[in-house]
């Protein structure tokens, strides 16, 4: 998880304060007992702040110590601050927990920028606004870190929800969700609705507001509109998927689809941006620039550095194109597309110009480690991580920000041939280097 590029996003109000909620559609899939329906106790259990992550409240130890934990589908360790740090209001105090067990093993996790290190142990863990269960889980007690915790973010740890293959120090350390499923009757599935506010929130607004929902063990009807469309999980390490086509305002980028997945494509709630491989990023920006050519923006804006501001309420959303990613479907030669709006890929930034302005950063950036479908994508959709059936589902989020002219969309089916060829096979020798940092 790399800060600045990973560790996301603004979160916001449950609902679409600047936009419209879409009417429910009736073409629902058949019920799957225990997995679909209402999970009212888990709805609205996420909070967060612009660019700094969505977090859920968890308790650790006996008696329970309450901590806010960042929800990260791009890593696989449950790691919590366990020593004083200037940016932490509270931390896990192992000595106060009667159920803590020391594994007498260290863990060191370097990133491209920054790192954390700690001591491995196990303890009892629960999620107050989650399933009514307690599990014994592996915990990395972070004793030292650099550029990991974020000042004012209000979270004290990270919940890595991906697979054991990318756990540190190695794949023998069982991730939290695996422990949860093994020890309880919770189905092997979770779903995320991340709600971008569409405008920056200050600290007090964040603490009072809702950032979305993490539904553990199921799918909640109220969180999406229309139908869920599923793409296979290509390999169980990250949540890896295959993109088969990319369009900007309906115009095909016309690249070899392998480029879209070079060297992988993942769904990652711990990354703010939509991150694209170098060649794809350059082609996409060229196409977005062309689509919005009635205005010109500074070079640094397209690099995600400079902010562009408009008088409050006058952001010209209409000049910016929609972006569609076509994902491999569950049926041979069938794909579906997810479409995001500029309301997702232009990220509101707070405290920079005057209150008379709305300012934004371009939240699509270049990657050297493949496509990362971060918050920019996820804020448009309700995303179902169906681990049991090795697939990820997308539906239009009931809280996504849009306007009266356009809305995010999930549409299909489309006929796409030779989709398997779109996947990139990472040479075995490269994998160890890939794991040391996510640029």
């Amino acid at each position: 998880t790399q800060h600045g590029i990973r560790l996301p996003l603004r979160s916001g109000l449950g609902g679409a304060p600047l936009g419209l909620r879409l009417p429910r559609e009736t073409d629902e899939e058949p019920e799957e007992p225990g997995r679909r329906g209402s999970f009212v106790e888990m709805v609205d259990n996420l909070r967060g702040k612009s660019g700094q992550g969505y977090y859920v409240e968890m308790t650790v130890g006996s008696p329970p110590q309450t901590l806010n934990i960042l929800v990260d589908t791009g890593s696989s360790n449950f790691a919590v601050g366990a020593a004083p740090h200037p940016f932490l209001h509270r931390y896990y105090q192992r000595q106060l927990s009667s159920t803590y067990r020391d594994l007498r093993k260290g863990v060191y996790v370097p990133y491209t920028q920054g790192k954390w290190e700690g001591e491995l142990g196990t303890d009892l863990v629960s999620i107050p606004h989650g399933p009514n269960v307690t599990v014994r889980a592996n915990i990395a007690a972070i004793t030292e870190s650099d550029k990991f915790f974020i000042n004012g973010s209000n979270w004290e740890g990270i919940l890595g929800l991906a697979y054991a293959e990318i756990a540190r120090p190695d794949d023998s350390l069982e991730p939290f969700f695996d422990s949860l499923v093994k020890q309880t009757h919770v189905p092997n599935l979770f779903s995320l609705q991340l709600c971008g506010a569409g405008f920056p929130l200050n600290q007090s607004e964040v603490l009072a507001s809702v950032g979305g929902s993490m539904i553990i063990g199921g799918i909640d009807h109220s969180l999406y509109t229309g139908s869920l469309w599923y793409t296979p999980i290509r390999r169980e390490w990250y949540y890896e998927v295959i993109i088969v086509r990319v369009e900007i305002n309906g115009q095909d980028l016309k690249m070899d689809c392998k480029e879209y997945n070079y060297d992988k494509s993942i769904v990652d709630s711990g990354t703010t941006n939509l991150r694209l491989p170098k060649k794809v990023f350059e082609a996409a920006v060229k196409s977005i620039k062309a689509a919005s050519s009635t205005e010109k923006f500074p070079d640094g804006f397209w690099l995600g550095e400079q902010l562009v501001c408009w008088q409050a309420g006058t952001t010209p959303w209409n000049i910016f194109p929609v972006i569609s990613l076509y994902l491999m479907g569950e049926v041979t030669n069938q794909s579906f597309r997810i479409t995001i709006l500029p309301q997702q890929y232009l990220r509101p930034v707070e405290d920079v110009a005057t209150s008379q302005d709305d300012c934004y950063k371009f939240a699509i950036s270049q990657s050297s480690t493949g496509t990362v479908m971060g918050a920019v994508i996820m804020e448009g959709f309700y995303v179902v991580f169906d681990r049991a059936r090795k697939r990820i589902g997308f539906a239009v989020s009931a809280c996504h920000v849009h306007d009266e002219f356009r809305t995010a969309a999930v549409e299909g089916p489309f006929v796409t041939l030779d989709m398997e060829d779109c996947g990139y096979n990472i040479p075995q020798t490269d994998e160890s280097t890939l794991m040391t940092g996510r640029a």
């Epitope: 009635t294 205005e295 010109k296 923006f297 640094g300 804006f301 400079q306 562009v308 501001c309 110009a353």
Partner: antibody
């Protein structure tokens, strides 16, 4: 080489509209690489950005002046213009037109400036 | 709003001396900062952009440094024509809009 020249009345009465034109010579105002801007400087004081325009007509204004400012472009004449309505003595300043270059982030070429006095 | 504060307001130096001018931003502007020189009765002239890049035709004695919130314009050895007012301007927030209050470099 490219040059900018401001023109317009040097004296404007209070409550009236100040109108200035900037003529671009030695190059095209329709270049996609630049915005064009107006900046003013009251006597003995610092610089204040008024607004900027792209050849397509897309405009950005200083929020503090927004309600009174209109900037327009005439590509056929290679000119862009400033109108500032309901002027007061506080609008007395040297008005500069400038090109916004270097990644459209900095004022890399300036006109000589024209002093506009608001007085009855 | 990002505020640029220049110091000192006035710098009294002799030709040949080194001048160090400061510009501090109220919050980070990354490296999106420029320096301008303005002589009496003339328009400003761009000296430095992106914190440290000299504009076309600017002598090597002018150099810029800094990033984030603290920036410095250095004139290694003052020439008689360098006595003027110097302004900084941020472009992190676009369109470029904010200038500092200026530093006057005068002959001692």
């Amino acid at each position: 080489q490219l040059q900018l020249q401001e023109s317009g009345p040097g004296l404007v009465k209070p409550s009236e509209t100040l109108s200035l034109t900037c003529t671009v010579s030695g190059g095209s105002i329709s270049s996609s690489s630049y915005y064009w801007g107006w900046i003013r400087q009251p006597p003995g004081k610092g610089l204040e950005w008024i607004g900027s325009i792209y050849y397509s007509g897309s405009t950005y204004y200083n929020p503090s002046l927004k309600s009174r400012v209109t900037i327009s472009v005439d590509t056929s004449k290679n000119q862009f213009s400033l109108k500032l309505s309901s002027v007061t003595a506080a609008d007395t300043a040297v008005y500069y037109c400038a090109r916004v270059g270097h990644g459209i982030s900095y004022f890399d070429l300036w006109g000589r400036g024209t002093l506009v006095t608001v007085s009855s | 709003e990002i505020v640029l504060t220049q110091s000192p307001a006035t710098l009294s130096l002799s030709p040949g001396e080194r001048a160090t001018l400061s510009c501090r931003a109220s919050q980070s502007v990354s490296s999106y900062l420029a320096w301008y020189q303005q002589k009496p009765g003339q328009a400003p002239r761009l000296l430095i952009y992106d914190a440290s890049n000299r504009a076309t035709g600017i002598p090597a004695r002018f150099s810029g440094s800094g990033s984030g919130t603290d920036f410095t314009l250095t004139i290694s050895s003052l020439e008689p024509e360098d006595f003027a007012v110097y302004y900084c301007q941020q472009a992190y927030v676009w369109p470029p809009r904010t200038f500092g209050g200026g530093t006057k470099v005068e002959i001692k």
